[in-house]
Amino acid sequence: MAVTACQGLGFVVSLIGIAGIIAATCMDQWSTQDLYNNPVTAVFNYQGLWRSCVRESSGFTECRGYFTLLGLPAMLQAVRALMIVGIVLGAIGLLVSIFALKCIRIGSMEDSAKANMTLTSGIMFIVSGLCAIAGVSVFANMLVTNFWMSTANMYTGMGGMVQTVQTRYTFGAALFVGWVAGGLTLIGGVMMCIACRGLAPEETNYKAVSYHASGHSVAYKPGGFKASTGFGSNTKNKKIYDGGARTEDEVQSYPSKHDYV
């Protein structure tokens, strides 16, 4: 039950995280005009990964796409790439994790296969989250560098008479959305990996063969590596799954290394 909950929660958290990464990538407010200690202007500038916008106080907003690819800064291209990789990995991870969910039955899929799929999706979510966090952090670093550079020459005098105000940019809402979303995707991925440990079979993938001794019930597994003793074992008829993996509603009556996840 705990495994199912962990897996389900991991899926939901990752889903929210990936939705957030997509939202952040599409948002226009990656960097916004710094209004602190700046002359009050009738326009508000903000920029995204794909276009820059200007909102006039009169209510009009005009956005222009970056219609060049080669003319864009390498850092911006890198951030775009990281965010897209994060989205793609996250989307694939979501697809894989849907089939890996313990509460969803697909044909006669073995629990070991579900465990592998859960681990795969978990790793994908972790990498996706890291990509998003990295992308947002690279952009934030770029902003900080540019901010202090523009602060150094905030006002560039023209012939000592005319002043040109340089627009400074600070962190936009998309950065915070990206950080949170990346973190959620990462957490979801970790939860999926933890859930995978609970789904994984104890030892091998061979069919378990039960030999009933006259004393207490001992289940022998071929290969002779380990014998599990069932203290107070559940006597209900249960289907024996490949590798002796437990069903989701089975009451565990003996401690296992997976009970502590």
Epitope: A42, N45, G59, Q163
Partner: antibody, heavy 117, light 113 residues
């Protein structure tokens, strides 16, 4: 079509307050900002302040302490209140609709306010 | 506050002539975000409210004849009337539409001979 009409008292005694109403039609105050501009007889234009679509306001720093701009979206009215009037406040007061490039695309006919005892 | 300086104060021309008037601002009106200059030109005929001619320094408002052309960038701007008509008799004002408070130039009065 877009129309703006100012209505004011005409004559105001010195040190008294001035209240002007700008009634608009053809557009919504929730979508467009309205500015107030005045013009003393035979002189140039002076921007007084503005109230924007979202309700935020900007004022001329020289007049900020005496000025107050508000609006009633449902009645399509914008209000200008100015305190402590002096004779040099005698002017034609215009309200104008904000447009692209923070320009004033549509103007009212103006209302002449004379400050005199 | 931004100071807008217009020159000349008066212009007397004959109909059909080309006329140019200047407007200078104390600070650049160029917005780096969209590379647009927030300078506006108005025409005020006697006894009438001002009429918008040009915004963003060079964009004509709808219904404005194409004989009116705005140009310039940063701090120096020009309004050109290619072929002055009798009905162009007016005062032309430039306006800083970038910094608060918005400020107007003192105007250029155009008179027709």
């Amino acid at each position: 079509q877009v129309q703006l009409k100012e209505s004011g008292p005409g004559l105001v005694a010195p040190s008294q307050s001035l209240s002007i109403t700008c009634t608009v039609s053809g557009f919504s105050l929730t979508s467009f900002g309205v500015s107030w501009v005045r013009q003393p007889p035979g002189k140039g234009l002076e921007w007084l302040g503005a109230i924007w679509a979202g309700g935020n306001r900007n004022y001329n720093s020289a007049l900020m302490s005496r000025l107050s701009i508000s609006k009633d979206n449902s009645k399509s009215q914008v209000f200008l209140k100015m305190t402590s009037l002096q004779t040099d406040d005698t002017a034609i007061y215009y309200c104008a609709r904000g447009s692209y490039g923070s320009s004033f695309a549509n103007w009212g006919q103006g209302t002449l306010v004379t400050v005199s005892s | 506050d931004i100071v807008m300086t217009q020159s000349p104060s008066f212009l007397t021309v004959t109909a059909g002539e080309k006329v140019t008037m200047s407007c200078k601002s104390s600070q650049s009106l160029l917005n780096s975000g969209n590379q647009k200059n927030y300078l506006t030109w108005y025409q005020q005929k006697p006894g009438q409210p001002p009429k918008l001619l040009i915004y963003w320094a060079s964009t004509r408002d709808s219904g404005v004849p194409d004989r009116f052309t705005g140009s310039g960038s940063g701090t120096d701007f020009t309004l050109t009337i290619t072929s002055v008509q009798a009905e162009d008799l007016a005062v032309f004002y430039c306006q800083n539409a970038y910094f608060y408070p918005f400020t107007f130039g003192s105007g250029t009065k155009l008179e027709i001979k």
